[in-house]
């Protein structure tokens, strides 16, 4: 059970950045999903390695004085989601605005019909372009 | 079947990153090979979880405009190579430079006899000491 | 056999990480333990993919001119300990300090009793927000 | 290239101390076990003390356990020996060497070694 998604650009204004089964992406079988293109949903029980990674673009004038963070969260059936995973990075001070690059990943146990998604600060400074931003995970 | 190799610094011009089996390095049978020093390739079909790191050292002022990116490419036989992940972080201002780390990691299929590599915007700006750089796969 | 362990602020004034089995934790089974509250220790012989990320807040004036390193070091029975891999990012210009994130994550083989832990070159500068600073293994 | 330069040696009488120095470059410091080694006149080789590359663990010769301790500050590349109640027998060139890494414990096998520094405990 395995997947590797791709980042989508959405005009939403939710945190939770949009994933799509496009370019070279993986989905094993499915016994994982991507539901809603926001969340992967696992059927099966089991410890799974969960990683995201996300190029954002920012301007520490243009943005506000709290840092980039990404969120890596679960949402377990019948419980309040929870942060598994968080990066932070200063915004830069290049002009217009400078690249950075964030990777999160672990071991965590899932139960079946969990759904683990990413959120980060300002969607409106991650980039898009070819393998720049992507997520998934494997079962162990 | 597994791999991580370590890099090695090169006098080649190529923007394709050099590595070696030396170090406390992986490989783990004659499944995975490192060809021509400069890629990992593969001999069977399968989910493989692959990843890169690079540090590197740059200055804004000593650099281009554009920021530093490190690409993790497959190759296919018969195929055009093809980006599969890639991370940008923008030059620091320390001087005379300032170092940055980058990690890229999925989980991507490949055909027998493909082949991955690293690919970064500037090779002379990479950091060799020990542990700095490193490249390597498993198969799930 | 896979942990996942989270980040504990240390009063103790050594380099080394301190972790506990806390929040989201994964502890599969006895054959990997946690010890001391610093190192991953295995029972078994095998090749393990292990990763930490440590997320740090520094400010380039109040800190050292060289710059944060995270090492991920192994210690074998009956031998020294070693360097696995090492991120290095330099510090930020933000004020009081600015957060940045270093992943870390390699294949390696590991003997029976082989402790995996990791250093860095200022614990007081390294975040324990929630999901902000991990460690972890699996094995293959 | 890896270059090992010891320093503060010097003459000194019995009982009394010394600190030597040795400054490390052109590898990675702190992924290194260091040892301190001397050649008394006219004599062989003789391991002295180990230190690991984090620091935290080290290793003596009976002859000088309770009186040497090494120590290493790896933000300066730079390993130390202290030598207090120095006694005639004490009298050698002490060289710094590096070791391999992950070496095995009792390993004494050294591929770079310093120029030396002397040590004199006479009265």
């Known amino acids: 059970i395995a997947a590797h998604v791709i980042s989508e650009a959405s005009s939403k204004t939710t945190s939770v950045l949009q994933w799509a089964e496009k370019g070279y992406y993986t989905m094993s079988n499915n016994l994982v999903t991507l539901e809603n293109g926001k969340q992967l949903t696992v059927k099966r029980q089991g410890l799974y390695y969960i990683y995201a990674q996300v190029t954002f673009c920012s301007n520490r004038e243009a943005s506000s004085q709290a840092p980039f963070i990404a969120s890596l969260c679960l949402k377990s059936p019948g419980r309040f989601e929870r942060i598994l995973l968080r990066a932070a990075n200063t915004h830069s001070s290049a002009k217009p605005c400078g690249q950075q690059s964030i990777h999160l990943g672990g071991v965590f146990e899932l139960q079946p019909g969990a759904s683990v998604f990413v959120n980060v600060t300002d969607p409106s400074q991650v980039s898009h372009g070819t393998g720049f931003t992507s997520f998934g995970l494997l079962k162990l | 079947i597994a791999a991580h190799v370590i890099s090695e610094a090169s006098s080649k011009t190529t923007s394709v990153l050099q590595w070696a089996e030396k170090g406390y390095y992986t490989m783990s049978n004659n499944l995975v090979t490192l060809e021509n020093g400069k890629q990992l390739t593969v001999k069977r079909q399968g989910l493989y979880y692959i990843y890169a790191q690079v540090t590197f050292c740059s200055n804004r002022e000593a650099s281009s405009q554009a920021p530093f990116i490190a690409s993790l490419c497959l190759k296919s036989p018969g195929r055009f190579e093809r980006i599969l992940l890639r991370a940008a972080n923008t030059h620091s201002s320390a001087k005379p430079c300032g170092q940055q780390s980058i990690h890229l990691g999925g989980v991507f299929e490949l055909q027998p006899g493909a082949s991955v590599f690293v690919n970064v915007t500037d090779p002379s700006q990479v950091s060799h000491g020990t542990g700095f750089t490193s490249f390597g796969l498993l198969k799930l | 056999i896979a942990a996942h362990v989270i980040s504990e602020a240390s009063s103790k004034t050594t380099s080394v990480l301190q972790w506990a089995e806390k929040g989201y934790y994964t502890m599969s089974n006895n054959l990997v333990t946690l010890e001391n509250g610093k190192q991953l220790t295995v029972k078994r012989q095998g090749l393990y993919y292990i990763y930490a990320q440590v997320t740090f807040c520094s400010n380039r004036e109040a800190s050292s001119q060289a710059p944060f390193i995270a090492s991920l070091c192994l210690k074998s029975p009956g031998r020294f300990e070693r360097i696995l891999l090492r991120a290095a990012n330099t510090h930020s210009s933000a004020k009081p300090c600015g957060q940045q994130s270093i992943h870390l994550g390699g294949v390696f083989e590991l003997q029976p009793g082989a402790s995996v832990f990791v250093n860095v070159t200022d614990p007081s500068q390294v975040s324990h927000g929630t999901g902000f600073t991990s460690f972890g293994l699996l094995k293959l | 290239e890896v270059q090992l330069l010891e320093s503060g040696g010097g003459l000194v009488q019995p009982g009394g101390s010394l600190r030597l120095s040795c400054a490390a470059s052109?590898?990675?410091?702190?992924?290194?076990?260091m040892s301190w080694v001397r050649q008394a006149p006219g004599k062989g080789l003789e391991w002295v003390s180990t230190?690991?590359?984090?620091?935290?663990?080290?290793y003596y010769a009976d002859s000088v356990k309770g009186r040497f301790t090494i120590s290493r500050d790896n933000s300066k590349n730079t390993l130390y020996l202290q030598m207090n109640s120095l006694r005639a027998e004490d009298t050698a060139v002490y060289y710094c060497?590096?070791?391999?890494?992950?070496?095995?414990?009792?390993?004494?096998?050294?591929?770079?070694w310093g120029q030396g520094t002397l040590v004199t405990v006479s009265s």
């Open positions: 060497a590096k070791l391999l890494m992950g070496e095995y414990l009792n390993s004494r096998t050294f591929d770079y």
């Open positions: 052109g590898f990675t410091f702190e992924g290194y076990p």
């Open positions: 230190i690991s590359p984090l620091g935290p663990d080290t």
